[in-house]
């Protein structure tokens, strides 16, 4: 009984198509597969960013796989051939591992890369990223931002930089069609006549960095002698009402502060007839239905009601928030 053996895949490599972190892992079938013509060979692929404790594992019949990586670090991957038990009289056979690595040769010292990179997707409409220059870089240093997401043919450079003292310190992005719910890759590199500048890579999903506009049209309605309903409206824009959570701050007679987080555009407050003044503000955030994370909006304009009218049936005063 001869032991069944199989070779590892050939020409295993990591290919960088220039998508700022979205890489292709590809390979060719192993040599000497003639004995297993009737068999469907599978491959077990393991890969990770160097320094990560866990490997991602994929079993596939294909000769390629694509995924996103952090190009600030190196990447390591290994693959072996699997022969299913149907091909080998009852036991799965594995080849030895083929291994490969990939990294971008770093230029410049780490301190030269941009600091405090911050990106916000305002009202799910306008993406703005800002950064600070690296430590100790000279004024002749300039930074350039490139970005890519699935759907673009190639990485694009920012065309509308925010500048300070002649240096690029941010980017206003154009309209980004079909760009949410997928990884968005950014590279900020730099150039200087005096010393090389280290590149920085960032990956996020746009729906998770949305900062909405504040709610508008805050109103009061007395429901009963001891209940007042607070209402507001969602701001103009592409975000539907079901995507919002709200935080309310209510102040009664300059003393009691009530805070609450709610899902709808109303909140019912228990009050007494003694209440003389009522003020509230609201802010909004994209909720778990539409994102994994988000940024609270600014607080709305404050809406107050004072005096005798508070005990009457309806208190309604529109107050438009100006942008």
């Amino acid at each position: 009984d001869t032991e069944i053996k199989v070779n590892p895949p050939q020409d295993f490599e990591i290919v960088d198509p220039g998508y700022l972190g979205y890489l292709y892992l590809q390979w060719q079938p192993p040599l000497s597969l003639d004995h297993f013509k009737e068999c469907t060979v599978e491959y077990e692929l393991k890969y990770r960013n160097i320094g990560s404790e866990t490997w991602k594992t994929i079993i596939t019949k294909n000769l390629h796989y694509k995924d996103g990586f952090d190009l600030n670090k190196g990447i390591e991957a290994k693959i072996h051939t699997l022969l299913p038990w149907q091909c080998t009289n009852g036991s799965e056979v594995q080849s030895s591992w083929a291994e490969t690595t990939y990294w971008i040769s770093p230029q410049g010292i780490p301190e030269t890369k941009v600091q405090d990179m911050d990106c916000v997707y305002y009202n799910w409409q306008y993406l703005l990223c800002s950064w600070k220059p690296g430590i100790g870089v000279l004024l002749d240093t300039n930074y350039n931002l490139f970005y890519w997401y699935e759907g673009l043919d190639h990485a694009l450079q920012c065309v509308d930089y925010i500048k300070a003292d002649g240096q690029n310190i941010g980017c206003r992005f154009p309209y980004l069609e079909a760009s949410d719910y997928k990884d968005f890759y950014i590279c900020v590199n730099g150039s200087s006549e005096n010393k090389p500048i280290r590149s920085s890579y960032f990956t996020f999903q746009l729906q998770n960095i949305v900062k909405p506009l504040p709610p508008v049209y805050l109103t009061f309605t007395r429901e009963s002698s001891c209940e007042i309903k607070l209402k507001w409206s969602i701001p103009l824009g592409p975000i539907p009402a079901r995507c919002f959570d709200y935080e309310i701050e209510i102040r009664e007679d300059d003393t009691t502060l009530v805070t609450a987080t709610v899902e709808n555009e109303t909140y019912t407050l228990k009050t007494t007839n003694e209440t003389r003044q009522l003020c509230f503000v609201v802010r909004s955030k994209v909720n778990i239905y539409c994102s994994d994370d988000g940024i609270w909006s600014e607080w709305s304009d404050k809406q107050c009601w004072e005096g005798e009218d508070l005990s009457k049936k309806t208190l309604l005063r529109h107050h438009h928030h100006h942008h």
Epitope: Y181, Q207, N208, I239, P240, R242, C243, N287, I288, Y289, C290, S291, D292, D293
Partner: nanobody, 115 residues
Framework: QVQLQESGGGLVQPGGSLRLSCAAS????????MGWYRQAPGKQRERVAG???????VYAASVEGRFTISRDNAKNTGYLQMNNLKPEDTAVYYC?????????WGQGTQVTVSS
């Protein structure tokens, strides 16, 4: 037409446990969040727990530490594990799957906590 079907409700004694399931008939879980709501007689419907597409969770203060929400995108199913149940947890429990484009509700499953 996408449908959500809750199951797992029933009668349980105080201190007991139940696990609710919410199965979707279509592939709507991928980028949508999922939530569990409840409505007791004469009360407003309230969100008990929610989970985003990436697995971030939120809980109502009244169930924090007792209820756990989870999801299995491959099976298009969400779950609510309810431990240490109290009489005040008695309600009809509804699941919801929603996102920027979608908003679907189940028909509800009755949970009764009584000795």
């Amino acid at each position: 037409q996408v449908q959500l079907q809750e199951s797992g409700g029933g009668l349980v004694q105080p201190g007991g446990s139940l696990r609710l399931s919410c199965a979707a008939s279509g592939s709507i879980f991928n980028t949508n969040g999922m939530g569990w709501y409840r409505q007791a007689p004469g009360k407003q419907r309230e969100r008990v727990a929610g989970i985003s597409s990436g697995g971030n969770t939120v809980y109502a203060a009244s169930v924090e530490g007792r209820f756990t929400i989870s999801r299995d995108n491959a099976k298009n199913t969400g779950y609510l594990q309810m431990n240490n149940l109290k009489p005040e947890d008695t309600a009809v429990y509804y699941c919801r799957v929603a996102g920027r484009q979608d908003d679907y509700w189940g028909q509800g499953t009755q949970v009764t906590v009584s000795s």
